[in-house]
């Protein structure tokens, strides 16, 4: 049967009793070998009477003495079987054996849970030689036990390739409960139940769990570990912890904050990164996410012009990267821009509105009703047009660009003329006779050159021809107008 020694009990002797024969318990050991680091089993020289046999492995020596008496079987003496002590206390236990002096080179090693202890352990082997046998006491001490020292310790001795194994000494280190699972911080939906888990172990067992919410005990009566607390829902942030109790005392888990998911705060610092005639690149700093990740954002754009109809354009985008290019805007226009973002709970309020303007752009349409005719008397081509609609000028007109291409007998020559914004007519000199002149006109703003009008062709005859009718931009459908006189 396993004998038990509690830490409160009287100290047990180094070995169970005095060795028979001449060895007294107060003898000074002949040889004492401490092993602090890199434990090496002690060499054994000498012998003594063996102790009584036990349940561990036994070696039966085959050697006989001069009188031909066979030697009794070798075995470790019984010692305390179970030591219970508190964490951080010191403990010392030992194995003892008496070995006939005829044996040389015997070694004792300590093993824990099937693995040899080779590290920085305090093992000391002491030898008490006598005429026929040597009493060997292998002591093992731990100055401040930890939970990791829990286990089954045995001594092993090798003699003539035989292994003698002692009975196990069970070390049970008791202490305050130790958490193996603590509650975790969570973000939860308002008024929705959720679970928290707490688990702690001894020894000693059992470990009982109390839950604490905002410093109030949730359960008057503890639950055996592990414990799952179903929280019926929260309306505001709460802090939870669990207390683990055993016979040694209590350990309190970390306190975890449970947050209530809410709609996000509005974005802040909406700013203009870049403006073009038809787009504005904006960025923003997201507000507090309401303990729930942002899903997407909405950019709201309305014309700042007091005469506009006040309609709002909405552009949806992903929450990252807090950047969006608003497109399809009018040039040289003022806009109010606001940003709102959403999480699983809902949409934030809109950020403070900011004012932004698009720049001038190149006109989006060409001048209209382009008309070309030949003024023979002055040897000029007269061109007339109507300026594009103001809305489609996309800026302030600074003038027009006229392209005229002269083609005759395999020769082609393009010339460009710049004309000021005042008026809607121009006169260009005839470059080549007996040739076709093709005219196109584009409106120009500081934002650039707009599209050219459809080409208008006029034939310039050789000198002496009369009666020139004008040529004009064709009605839709006539792709390549030409005037033949």
């Amino acid at each position: 049967a396993i004998t038990e020694a509690r830490e409160e009990a009287k100290p047990y002797p180094l070995f169970p009793g005095p060795f028979p024969g001449s060895l007294q318990t107060d003898h000074t050991p002949l040889l004492s070998l401490p092993h602090a680091s890199g434990y090496q089993p002690a060499l054994m020289f000498s012998p003594t009477q063996p102790g009584r046999p036990h349940t561990g492995n036994v070696a039966i020596p085959q050697v006989t003495s001069v009188e031909s008496k066979p030697l009794p079987p070798l075995a470790f003496k019984h010692t305390v079987g179970h030591i219970i002590l508190s964490e951080h206390k010191g403990v010392k236990f030992n194995c003892s054996i008496s070995v006939p002096n005829i044996y040389q080179d015997t070694t004792i090693s300590w093993w824990k849970d099937g693995k040899e202890l080779l590290g920085a352990h305090h093992a000391i082997t002491q030898f008490y030689p006598d005429d026929e046998v040597t009493a060997i006491i292998a002591s093992f001490s731990i100055t401040s036990v930890q939970r990791s020292d829990n286990g089954s310790y045995i001594c092993k001795m090798k003699i003539n390739n035989e292994e003698i194994v002692s009975d196990p000494i069970y070390i049970e280190v008791q202490g305050l409960p130790h958490f193996t699972k603590q509650p975790e911080s969570m973000n939860v939906t308002r008024n929705t139940a959720f679970n928290l888990t707490c688990q702690a172990v001894g020894p000693p067992e059992p470990v009982n769990i109390f839950w604490v919410q905002n410093s109030s005990r949730v359960n008057e009566q503890p639950e055996k570990s592990p414990s799952v607390l179903t929280v019926p829902g929260l309306t505001e942030m709460a802090v939870f912890s669990c207390e683990a109790h055993n016979d040694k005392g209590l350990t309190v888990s970390k306190g975890v904050q449970i947050n209530i998911k809410a709609i996000p705060s509005p974005p802040t610092e909406v700013s203009i990164r870049n403006s073009t005639a038809h787009s504005i690149l904006i960025s923003w700093v997201p507000g507090f996410d309401g303990y729930s990740p942002f899903r997407n954002c909405s950019i709201q754009v309305k014309e700042a012009d007091p005469l506009s109809n006040g309609s709002v354009m909405i552009f949806n985008t992903s929450a990252l990267p807090h950047l969006y290019q608003i497109k399809q805007l009018q040039a040289l226009a003022n806009y109010s821009i606001g940003v709102s973002c959403m999480n699983e709970i809902g949409w934030s309020a809109v950020s403070p509105w900011i004012l932004a303007s698009t720049t001038e752009g190149a006109p989006s349409v060409a001048p209209l009703n382009v008309t070309v005719f030949l003024n023979e008397s002055s040897d000029n081509v007269d061109i007339r047009w109507m300026k594009p609609p103001t809305k489609q000028q996309d800026g302030e007109l600074v003038g027009y660009r006229i392209s005229h291409v002269w083609q005759s007998a395999g020769i082609s020559k393009e010339l460009l003329e710049e004309v000021g914004q005042n008026g809607s007519r121009a006169r260009i000199s005839v470059q080549v006779h007996n040739a076709t002149c093709t005219v196109r006109i584009a409106a120009v703003t500081r934002g650039g050159v707009g599209p050219f009008s459809d080409p208008v062709k006029i034939f310039i005859p050789a000198h002496g021809w009369v009666d020139y009718a004008p040529s004009s931009t064709p009605a839709p459908g006539n792709a390549d107008p030409v005037l033949i006189i």
Partner: antibody, heavy 118, light 106 residues
Framework: QIQLVQSGPELKKPGETVKISCMAS????????VTWVKQAPGQGLQRMGW????????TYADDFKGRFVFSLETSANTAHLQINNLKNEDTATYFC???????????WGTGTTVTVSS | QIVLSQSPAILSSSPGEKVTMTCRAS?????MHWYQQKPGSSPKPWIY???NLASGVPARFSGSGSGTSYFLTISRVEAEDAATYYC?????????FGGGTKLEIK
């Protein structure tokens, strides 16, 4: 089916002792505390205290310290309330209740009426 | 200890009406429980942790509130709802009950 069945009505004289029982069934008795609640005639509910059915440790509300004793007979899944040196103001119906998390009394006993009269 | 005040003390209502009774706490609490008691009977658990209906409680009942103000609402009162309703807080020892609201049906 979870239930708490209480002993029958009692008629006592001032100075006497009464012992009320509350027998639990349908659940593991030692996992939930038992709370005792007093309801005087025409009055509201007043928690007298509770007993830990696992450890047997009783806790008394301030107004119920001294003459009142909570005890257990765990083998019979039964909690007891004993009132010593009865007074007229002890006339009331006494309820036992199972205590759940958040001190929610999720199962109530049938009630025991104690009348103290000379 | 936390004192719970229930109002009104007596509430008179006709079938089909919506009624709300209030429980105010002298200090903030995180949950409120409610119990229903009919004359000559034991109290019955009615609403757990502010808003969770106990087993068998009709869906016309609801609970709400936070901090120091909690409410029990019946969307359409029925004759069988006539009873006294008690609120109870758990946060602070000792757990305390309100004085009750008696619901009468005309």
């Amino acid at each position: 089916q979870i239930q708490l069945v209480q002993s029958g009505p009692e008629l006592k004289k001032p100075g006497e002792t009464v012992k009320i029982s509350c027998m639990a069934s349908g659940y593991t008795f030692t996992t939930h505390g038992v709370t005792w609640v007093k309801q005087a005639p025409g009055q509201g509910l007043q928690r007298m205290g509770w007993i830990n059915t696992y450890s047997g440790v009783p806790t008394y509300a301030d107004d119920f310290k001294g003459r009142f004793v909570f005890s257990l007979e765990t083998s019979a899944n039964t909690a007891h309330l004993q009132i010593n040196n009865l007074k007229n103001e002890d006339t009331a119906t006494y309820f036992c209740a199972r205590t759940n998390n958040y001190r929610y009394f999720d199962v109530w006993g049938t009630g025991t009426t104690v009348t103290v009269s000379s | 200890q936390i004192v719970l005040s229930q109002s009104p003390a007596i509430l008179s209502s006709s079938p089909g009406e919506k009624v709300t009774m209030t429980c105010r706490a002298s200090s903030s609490v995180s949950y409120m429980h409610w119990y229903q008691q009919k004359p000559g009977s034991s109290p019955k658990p009615w609403i757990y942790a502010t808003s969770n209906l106990a087993s068998g409680v009709p869906a016309r009942f609801s609970g709400s509130g936070s901090g120091t103000s909690y409410f029990l609402t019946i969307s359409r009162v029925e004759a069988e709802d006539a009873a006294t309703y008690y609120c109870q807080q758990w946060n602070t020892d000792p757990p305390t009950f309100g004085g009750g609201t008696k619901l009468e049906i005309k």
